[in-house]
């Protein structure tokens, strides 16, 4: 099923791409290109008899196109508003700049202390899981070599089950690996929430009448940090998938060589163990630093906040994260409204359905209106 997150990511990536190109590109939005990218998401789904996906696609594309145009128009306006918000917040905090800076520093240290054990555990888990994967797969290579020595005559029959089992074992182990490693990202999210909430409460008395503005800035920080956690999750998943892609051909290679001569098979089996070791080791080397790098990114984001709220803040391009957050909120809201309507539609008569569709169109309009309403 196509998710709100996938749609929002396509839209945001497309918007970022345009924004990075010349200004004119933003003004002359190639609607067709965005439509194509969104339609591509549905391609696989529409093969099945799936009226839900088809209906969603029909309603989503116009909504997304309109939302995208609004995004481009509101970007500058939002930048101005965020700038003004920060100015007011900075003015309120200025007399206590040292205390506020110290508070953010304390909070940063706390966050590091909270995350360090998880980053260490992640590193250890990567090693442990990689080692386990290696231990689980190596015996297959050894067993097949033994079978090759003992059953030179009936190779096909003797080795095929082992080769098939190796393939299945690779899949199973990689899934297990993902299952063990990705939950760390969710743990990180919980710690982010706790830490930012503590920061909000300890800074609230300084902000006093600008508390809403402070909350808004901290929402932006939370969004960025959690986005990092999501990226960490995605990177771990992608690396595990890549490992699967690299291990699968090894099993395939053995299966392919079953039809060939014994010599080729012998060579293939002799190399199998080494290849397994090499791929698993490469995975371990690549993924081990992920937790540490994630922590560094969070520290950097917290430091940026300290700078933004400090007396000597430069021109911080912070509005884009608010724009993205708003886009994601709007797409989520569209999806939940659509799902609600979908479940209601199943029990509605035709006239009720038609009436509801009219209301739905009006609602879509409202959802697109004012992309980023800032608290004043």
């Amino acid at each position: 099923e196509v998710s709100a997150d996938q749609v929002a990511t396509v839209m945001w990536d497309y918007f970022s791409q345009l924004s990075n190109n010349a200004k004119e590109a933003v003004e002359h939005l190639q609607k067709s290109e965005l439509t194509q990218q969104l339609n591509a998401l549905f391609q696989d789904k529409l093969g099945e008899v799936n009226t839900y996906a088809g209906d969603l696609q029909k309603k989503l594309v116009p909504f997304a196109t309109e939302l995208h145009e609004r995004l481009a128009k509101d970007s500058e306006k939002l930048k101005e508003e965020i700038g003004k918000e920060l100015e007011e917040l900075r003015a309120r905090l200025l007399p206590h700049a040292n205390e506020v800076s110290q508070k953010i520093g304390d909070n940063l240290r706390e966050l590091q202390q909270r995350l360090e054990p998880y980053a260490d555990q992640l590193r250890t888990q990567v090693s442990t899981q990689a080692e386990q994967l290696r231990r689980q797969l190596t015996p297959y290579a050894q067993r097949m070599e033994r079978v090759l020595r003992e059953n030179a005559d009936s190779l096909q029959a003797s080795l095929r089950p082992h080769a098939d089992e190796l393939k299945a074992k690779i899949d199973q182990n990689v899934e297990e690996l993902k299952g063990r490693l990705t939950p760390y990202a969710d743990e990180f999210k919980v710690k982010i929430d706790q830490t930012v909430e503590e920061l909000r409460r300890s800074l609230a008395p300084y902000a006093q009448d600008t508390q809403e503005k402070l909350n808004h800035q901290l929402e932006g920080l939370t969004f960025q940090m959690k986005k990092n956690a999501e990226e960490l999750k995605a990177r771990i998943s992608a690396s595990a998938e890549e490992l699967r892609q690299r291990l699968a051909p090894l099993a395939e290679d053995v299966r392919g060589n079953l039809r060939g001569n014994t010599e080729g098979l012998q060579k293939s089996l002799a190399e199998l163990g080494g290849h397994l070791d090499q791929q698993v080791e490469e995975f371990r080397r690549r993924v081990e630093p992920y937790g540490e790098n994630f922590n560094k990114a969070l520290v950097q984001q917290m430091e940026q906040l300290r700078q933004k709220l400090g007396p000597h803040a430069g021109d911080v391009e912070g509005h884009l994260s608010f724009l993205e957050k708003d886009l994601r909120d709007k797409v989520n809201s569209f999806f939940s409204t659509f799902k609600e309507k979908e479940s209601q539609d199943k029990t509605l008569s035709l006239p009720e359905l038609e009436q509801q569709q009219e209301q739905q169109q009006e609602q879509q309009q409202e959802q697109v209106q004012m992309l980023a309403p800032l608290e004043s």
Partner: antibody
């Protein structure tokens, strides 16, 4: 309705200590600083210090360091100020005041008399 | 610490008159200044903060102005309840300090 209710008047002997309190109601206690202010008879106002009720962080006027100790009890939304080693110079009305951009709410004041 | 010099120390005026009180900090406090009114035997009441912003519920006959090292509190059309003492206070870098006060009496 926001209210700061202070404890009653105190008559204490020189050298003793006293703890006066300020109970807050009608707002989120941990969301605002609480300050304490001294007003000697017929005189102006002097800021003693402030406390962040969320985490207990305190900031004192150098003049009152060692004389006043500020604490809070979050469970009862009450701020306390303890005054140590009292002398006749400490006789005054003491107020608690909420906020950081001027004190928008004040307690009714606690009169402290130090006399043998 | 920042010293706050308030003037005049006292003044007499009649109901309906307009009066202005001045406050001079010993250094630049930008716009971080508050004004209070205190009646005999009562707690002070916040009138203005950030030099010019009227606190909630304060009548519009009160107005604050100035920035840096010179600030003013102006009361138009004095009412009987306006008599008492007025204090300025900076809310810039701690420690916060108050002016010596201005006693406003009925003529």
């Amino acid at each position: 309705e926001v209210q700061l209710q202070q404890s009653g008047p105190e008559l204490v002997k020189p050298g003793a200590s006293v703890k006066i309190s300020c109970k807050a109601s009608g707002y989120s206690f941990i969301g605002y600083f609480m300050s304490w202010v001294k007003q000697s008879h017929g005189k102006s106002l002097e800021w003693i210090g402030r406390i962040n009720p969320y985490n207990g962080d305190t900031f004192y006027n150098q003049k009152f360091k060692g004389k006043a100790t500020l604490t809070v009890d979050k469970s009862s939304s009450t701020a306390h100020m303890e005054l140590l080693s009292l002398t006749s110079e400490d006789s005054a009305v003491y107020y608690c005041g909420r906020g950081i951009i001027g004190f928008d709410y004040w307690g009714q004041g606690t009169t402290l008399t130090v006399s043998s | 610490d920042i010293q706050m010099t308030q003037s005049p120390a006292s003044l007499s005026a009649s109901v309906g008159e307009t009066v202005t009180i001045t406050c001079r900090p010993s250094e630049n406090i930008h716009s971080y200044l508050a004004w209070y009114h205190q009646k005999q035997g009562k707690s002070p009441q916040l009138l203005v903060y950030d030099a010019t912003t009227l606190a909630e519920g304060v009548p519009s006959r009160f107005s604050g102005s100035g920035s840096g090292t010179q600030f003013f509190l102006k009361i138009n059309s004095l009412q009987p309840e306006d008599f008492g003492s007025y204090y300025c206070q900076h809310h810039y870098v701690s420690p916060w300090t108050f002016g010596g006060g201005t006693k406003l009496e009925i003529k």
